[in-house]
């Protein structure tokens, strides 16, 4: 499947998952905490202030690094999965902290967490990597 299609699908699924999570957690627009979001790379569930959210490396890095083997499980398609099963010390895990000022930036940044061989596809069709 073309990367554009993968990510349109991922984004749509993300928005659905966020909506379900908001209902489960009793979140609304005026709730304190951090709203769920699609950051154009992966999906982040809503979180309370002080909560750290962990995610597995997104699909994008399976395109960038087709030979990469991930040690962590992929978060389920129907919900956000059990992020307690993920550990920041694992390769392939990215976190964001929910603070009073909103979400922190990813830690580590995606390339550091998910691995990236910048020379592997140097001559490849760069348009293939556009998301939209």
């Amino acid at each position: 499947m073309h990367s554009d299609c993968i990510f349109k699908k991922e984004q749509a699924m993300c928005l659905e998952k966020i909506q379900r999570a908001n209902e489960l957690m009793g979140f609304n627009d005026s709730s304190p905490g951090c709203p769920g979001m699609w950051d154009n790379i992966t999906c982040w569930k809503p979180a309370h202030v002080g909560e750290m959210v962990l995610v597995s490396c997104p699909e994008l890095f399976r395109i960038f690094n087709p030979d990469q083997v991930w040690e962590t499980e992929t978060i389920g398609e129907s919900d956000f999965g059990d992020s307690n099963s993920l550990d920041l010390s694992d390769m392939g895990v990215v976190s964001r902290n929910c603070t009073e000022d909103g979400w922190s930036e990813p830690f580590p940044h995606y390339f550091d967490a998910c691995g990236f061989d910048e020379y592997e596809s140097e001559t490849g069709d760069q348009d293939y990597y556009y998301l939209s």
């Epitope: 994008l60 760069q126 998301l131």
Partner: antibody, heavy 120, light 107 residues
Framework: QVQLVESGGGVVQPGRSLRLSCAAS????????MHWVRQAPGKGLEWVAV????????YYAESVKGRFTISRDNSKNTLYLQMNSLRAEDTALFYC?????????????WGQGTLVTVSS | EIVLTQSPATLSLSPGERATLSCRAS??????LHWYQQKPGQAPRLLIK???QSLSGIPARFSGSGSGTDFTLTISSLEPEDFAVYYC?????????FGPGTKVDIK
């Protein structure tokens, strides 16, 4: 090897506009976030803006928000900074830098900079 | 925004001495703190990423430590080429910020 070459700097009057360019080579430009960082003469570094690998995410320092626009053309391996309503305090050496990430990242390779002087 | 404070502003030392540079954040940045070296007339160079991770091509005498709000860059034994300005940078929260720098000069 990674190469970043800035251009477009010069002397401009307050209130006018200027567009900086940064030509990238030696890496797959379309996969990396890119930053602009500036340095006023004799002063420290000031982060200005960042753009994600596909241009979908753009973030700015408060001091330039609403006046500067970061953009990129991945088909030309070029990063841009459109600067409007320039002020004397914008006088600085402007560096473009590669962000080691798809989204934002930290600058890992830097160009040599292009000097912008805002003066009447 | 997160304000980074570096101390001292200037550090006067002799070659062979140990240099200890400090960077303090106004709020926690976790480990998303990076160190750069800048020599006169040159672009900055990344020295340490994520507070303590070394980079290939950077001499082993450069090391970093810390997390949260307090960070340290240590140069174990100063070489003549190490006299420069050192900046810390946080990529934990937007807008990203740099510290004001510490100048390491020859005593």
């Amino acid at each position: 090897q990674v190469q970043l070459v800035e251009s477009g700097g010069g002397v401009v009057q307050p209130g006018r506009s200027l567009r900086l360019s940064c030509a990238a080579s030696g890496f797959t430009f379309s996969r990396f976030a890119m930053h602009w960082v500036r340095q006023a003469p004799g002063k420290g570094l000031e982060w200005v803006a960042v753009i994600s690998f596909d241009g979908g995410n753009k973030y700015y320092a408060e001091s330039v928000k609403g006046r500067f626009t970061i953009s990129r053309d991945n088909s030309k391996n070029t990063l841009y900074l459109q600067m409007n309503s320039l002020r004397a305090e914008d006088t600085a050496l402007f560096y473009c830098a590669r962000g080691y990430d798809v989204l934002t990242g930290y600058p890992d390779y830097w160009g040599q900079g292009t000097l912008v002087t805002v003066s009447s | 925004e997160i304000v980074l404070t570096q101390s001292p502003a200037t550090l006067s030392l002799s070659p062979g001495e140990r240099a200890t540079l400090s960077c303090r954040a106004s709020q926690s940045v976790g480990r998303s703190l990076h160190w750069y070296q800048q020599k006169p007339g040159q672009a900055p160079r990344l020295l340490i990423k994520y507070a303590s991770q070394s980079l290939s091509g950077i001499p082993a005498r450069f090391s970093g430590s810390g997390s949260g709000t307090d960070f340290t860059l240590t140069i174990s034994s100063l070489e003549p080429e190490d006299f420069a300005v050192y900046y810390c940078h946080q990529s934990s929260r937007l807008p990203f910020t740099f510290g004001p720098g510490t100048k390491v000069d020859i005593k």
